[in-house]
Interface confidence: medium
Amino acid sequence: LTCLGGFASPGPVPPSTALRELIEELVNITQNQKAPLCNGSMVWSINLTAGMYCAALESLINVSGCSAIEKTQRMLSGFCPHKVSAGQFSSLHVRDTKIEVAQFVKDLLLHLKKLFREGQFN
């Protein structure tokens, strides 16, 4: 496999826009949810105040074959400065509680909305 040339880039998305787009995608997931999200798959709960973006990705990346969260997984991969692979838990320092993907998405959405309201686009 040879990969020459990255995806076309119209310019960097400002952090505030990137965060808003992620929030919109999570809203979309929660509103369109009919059957249990990702067949009720369980993921590790994360500390939403500690290196949240990589931790969220490290948790969600272990869910495969769930088209509903594929875009979220892609978006989060751009929010994390290091490459994340399934089974990697470098940011998930504490792995003690598993929750359903649907609950994980709701918790993440609430936290991101709070950050957005407070203008924390870091």
């Epitope: 990969c3 020459l4 040339g5 990255g6 995806f7 880039s9 960097p12 998305v13 952090p15 990137a18 965060l19 105040t49 500690a50 290196g51 949240m52 973006y53 990589c54 991969s77 751009g78 929010f79 400065p81 290091h82 490459k83 990697q88 470098s90 940011s91 203008g119 924390q120 686009f121 870091n122």
Partner: antibody
Framework: EVQLVQSGAEVLKPGATVLISCKVS????????MHWVQQAPGKGLEWMGR????????KYAPKFHDRVTITADTSTDTAYMELSSLRSEDTAVYYC???????????WGQGTLVTVSS | QAVVTQEPSLTVSPGGTVTLTCRSS?????????ANWFQQKPGQAPRTLIY???NRAPWTPARFSGSLLGGKAALTLSGAQPEDEAEYYC?????????FGTGTKVTVL
């Protein structure tokens, strides 16, 4: 042993384009993001962008996004950084550097000096 | 775009303690900025000291530590050695790009 070996120094005229290569060994290039950093003489460090060599997805710094293109050739384990429309203030050392959680920016190329002069 | 500011220069006595800070123009630095600290000596590539706010690289001496202090990222050098004289840079991640700090020249005198 992990190594990042960059192409040699370049002297170019304003308006030209430079292409710098970064050949990696000791690991598979698709396993980690590759970042590029600029350092002008006597100045600080500037992040230019990064690539996921696995799928070619890139992120660029706002300052450089309209002039920089970062690519990767997985068949030769080589990353590239192309900077176009060169001006005198682009005279700098350019570094490629590997990033992963357990060793962010732990491995650096030796640097490539680009001199832009008419 | 955010601006990341550091003290231009700091002087520390051998064996003394000095704290370098890294301020973000957009507000408080958090763990989601994945703060990195680098040391650079003349003619050399930068070397990572601290990553992810407070994790030491394997080669980083225990006298260097990273933290969050009053809304800023901080690098504390306790028990300074002559070989610690160098330029120090921080880098903060802003959701989809890094920004390096302006750099601090540390003199051990």
């Amino acid at each position: 042993e992990v190594q990042l070996v960059q192409s040699g120094a370049e002297v170019l005229k304003p308006g030209a384009t430079v292409l710098i290569s970064c050949k990696v060994s000791g690991y598979t290039i698709t396993d980690y993001y590759m970042h590029w950093v600029q350092q002008a003489p006597g100045k600080g460090l500037e992040w230019m962008g990064r690539i996921d060599p696995e799928d070619g997805e890139t992120k660029y710094a706002p300052k450089f996004h309209d002039r920089v293109t970062i690519t990767a050739d997985t068949s030769t384990d080589t990353a590239y950084m192309e900077l176009s429309s060169l001006r005198s203030e682009d005279t700098a050392v350019y570094y490629c550097t590997r990033y992963d959680y357990y060793g962010p920016f732990a491995y650096w190329g030796q640097g490539t000096l680009v001199t832009v002069s008419s | 775009q955010a601006v990341v500011t550091q003290e231009p220069s700091l002087t520390v006595s051998p064996g003394g303690t000095v704290t370098l800070t890294c301020r973000s123009s957009t507000g408080a630095v958090t763990t989601s900025n994945y703060a990195n600290w680098f040391q650079q000596k003349p003619g050399q590539a930068p070397r990572t000291l601290i990553y992810g706010t407070n994790n030491r690289a394997p080669w980083t001496p225990a006298r260097f530590s990273g933290s969050l202090l009053g809304g800023k990222a901080a690098l504390t050098l306790s028990g300074a050695q002559p070989e610690d004289e160098a330029e120090y840079y921080c880098a903060l991640w802003y959701i989809n790009h890094f920004i390096f700090g302006t750099g601090t020249k540390v003199t051990v005198l």
